[in-house]
Interface confidence: low
């Protein structure tokens, strides 16, 4: 018994292809690359039908449907643009992922181009089916600083020129330290900011002396010390990590990391600082920012900053030798011999940064740590040296520039 002639589906074929088919002959229906067999709303790779005894086929010929990769996955801090008209998501359609510039950039300068494959998945030549990663851009403020005047005792910072600065605030709104945003969810600050003053009789740091994550908050995008404005982002604290070799008596390794409960929205007023790429040269000019005390023991209304030079390590050691204070390799000093420009109470943990003129990018050199009084002649400010502890910071945070 002969079965009727078979027509292959559009974008498909039947095998074997014969002039005549008889009882018990079987044919396999398959589709071209990028198409799937569709039978009774079920997608499959192939479909088999058989010529029956009564001269009819066991099933109707299925259709071939173009493969659909469906809506592509969302990219955190990224955007999707469709290269194909009508936002098609079918076989050979192309999409392009990009990052929310200028605050995020794509890791490894990936093209971000993905094509809908015959298997129904979006594929990139380098990353395969994995999505690209949008990393925060560091150290490139939207508002560039005007040339610093060498003003005695600092000057008010221009709004938005220090977008990495963080305020550590008690939950009653009282600021107590500074810090810097690293990556998208970390704050680097001074370890001594995160514990209560120790008993001089028993200067051992115990867990009970540490600030609990629920005892303080981080404010980013802040300009005014106490007044709030629309650019501020208040964030909770997930976890704090003090440097394992931190010594609260000598302030060695006076650096700590604060992990945020949620990532801030990066914008013109909130942006991370870059980690240093190498050691800092003496004599280089750095900028130190904070809301700490000014001369006459007054707190400023807005963020203040000073521009000072890095001081040779041995010069700084000699300056503190009479006070029996050690300036160790994990510390870096800055200031002017005649004094007058210095960090002070309330600035601790805040950033000391420098500009890489070739790249136009700002890098973290140190965090405000300690000193003898504020702005004293022959007494330089001492900062925790970030380059010295960069490996530890990167290990804990996973942050890379």
């Amino acid at each position: 018994n002969e079965c009727p002639e078979l027509q292959p589906p559009v974008h498909g074929k039947i095998e074997p292809s014969q002039a005549k088919y008889f009882f018990k002959d079987q044919v396999l229906v398959s589709c071209d690359t990028g198409y799937k067999v569709l039978k009774d709303n079920v997608e499959m790779d192939t479909f088999q039908i058989e010529c029956l005894k009564d001269g009819t086929w066991s099933n109707k010929i299925p259709t071939c449907k173009i493969v659909d990769c469906r809506a592509p996955g969302e990219l955190e801090h990224g955007l999707i643009t469709f290269s194909t008209r009508n936002n098609l998501t079918t076989y050979k359609s192309e999409i392009k992922y990009s990052c929310q510039e200028p605050y995020y950039k794509m890791l490894n300068n990936n093209t971000g181009i993905y094509t809908c494959s015959a298997q129904g998945v979006w594929m990139n030549k380098v990353l395969g089916r994995s999505l690209p990663t949008c990393l925060p851009v560091c150290g490139l403020p939207k508002f560039s600083r005007k040339l610093m005047a060498r003003i005695f005792n600092g000057r008010p910072a221009q709004k938005g020129t220090t977008p990495w600065i963080a305020m550590l605030s008690h939950l009653n709104g009282q600021p107590f330290c500074g810090g810097s945003l690293l990556g998208s969810s970390w704050i680097v600050t001074a370890a001594h900011c995160l514990h209560q003053s120790l008993d001089p009789e028993d200067p051992t740091l115990r867990d009970s002396d540490l600030l609990s994550p629920s005892d303080f908050k981080i404010i980013l995008g802040k300009h005014w010390r106490l007044r709030s404005d629309e650019n501020e982002q208040h964030l909770g604290v997930k976890h704090t990590t003090l440097h394992p070799q931190y010594d609260p008596n000598t302030f060695e390794n006076d650096v700590a990391l604060v992990e945020l409960l949620e990532s801030p929205v990066l914008n013109a007023f909130v942006m991370p600082i870059c980690l240093p790429e190498g050691p800092q040269q003496e004599g280089a000019m750095v900028i130190v920012s904070g809301w700490g005390k000014q001369f006459l023991q007054r707190f400023p209304e807005t963020l203040m900053e000073i521009e000072i030079p890095i001081v040779d390590h041995s010069t700084c050691q000699k300056a503190y030798a009479p006070l029996k204070k050690k300036v160790t390799r994990d510390m870096i000093c800055a200031g002017e011999k005649e004094g007058g420009k210095d960090a002070c109470a309330g600035d601790a943990g805040g950033p000391m940064v420098t500009l890489n003129r070739e790249r136009g990018q700002w890098y973290l050199v140190g965090t405000v740590s300690w000193g003898d009084d504020c702005g004293k002649k022959d007494r330089y400010g001492v900062y925790s040296y970030i380059h010295h502890n960069k490996d530890w910071i990167q290990r804990v945070t996973g942050v890379r520039n």
């Epitope: 009653n172 709104g173 005892d215």
Partner: antibody, heavy 119, light 112 residues
């Protein structure tokens, strides 16, 4: 999302009483929860708060008089030794999300449970 | 401990009018202030936080202002439904919360 207090009743002075706040639609591991009371015809009085991480903070006047604890879906307030001054409606309230600076103003309240202390 | 002193009760105003309720703190509270509305037999409802931020679902007729120790709740275009007692709350967290979280005594608003 809701919070509901239970356990309020008439007790004699000195008899410990535990009030329970049952939450639904959200996780106590993400939110700070507080207790506030209101004596008949009087204003609101803050008792204390338990953080998402389990840290407990009491108003100075409430220390020793109340104990706050929690399980995965309930927050308890124990009145250790009630006096007639503890007669009030006790409210359980959810504070702002812990991820947003953990500020403890309350934006989700229960209807309250009435405790009457009388001999 | 911080003490919050509110405008004495009752405050009376006509429908369509404006009411202002003051809340004075005994010390600087850094705008960590919330306002609540409570109607008889009901639970309190959050209106304002951070001294001036409107809570979700609250009509813009309600507004908060102030800094330092002086704070104000203003209700404009008064409606009958606004008859209630209004409380200010100073809030804090962590070790600061022991004496930080305090309510004012409440101000009753009556609509003429």
């Amino acid at each position: 999302q809701s919070v509901e207090e239970s356990g309020g009743r008439l007790v004699t002075p000195g008899t410990p009483l535990t009030l329970t706040c049952t939450v639904s639609g959200f996780s106590l591991s993400n939110y700070n929860m507080g207790w506030v009371r209101q004596a008949p015809g009087e204003g609101l009085e803050y008792i204390g708060i338990i953080s998402s991480q389990g840290d407990i903070y009491y108003a100075t006047w409430a220390k020793g008089r109340f104990t706050i604890s929690k399980t995965s879906t309930t927050v308890d307030l124990k009145i250790t030794s009630p006096t007639t001054e503890d007669t009030a409606t006790y409210f359980c309230a959810r504070a702002r999300h812990v991820g947003s600076a953990a500020d403890s103003y309350f934006h989700l309240w229960g209807l309250g449970t009435l405790v009457t202390v009388s001999s | 401990a911080v003490v919050l002193t509110q405008t004495a009760s009752p405050v009376s105003a006509a429908v369509g009018g404006t009411v202002t309720i003051n809340c004075q703190a005994s010390e600087e509270i850094y705008r960590n202030l919330a306002w609540y509305q409570q109607k008889p037999g009901q639970r309190p409802k959050l209106l304002i936080y951070g001294a001036s931020n409107l809570a979700s679902g609250v009509p813009s007729r309600f507004s908060g202002s102030g800094s330092g120790t002086e704070y104000t709740l203003t209700i404009s275009d008064l409606e009958c439904a606004d008859a209630a007692t209004y409380y200010c709350q100073r809030y804090a967290w962590g070790k600061n919360s022991a004496d930080g979280n305090t309510f004012g005594g409440g101000t009753k608003v009556e609509i003429k």
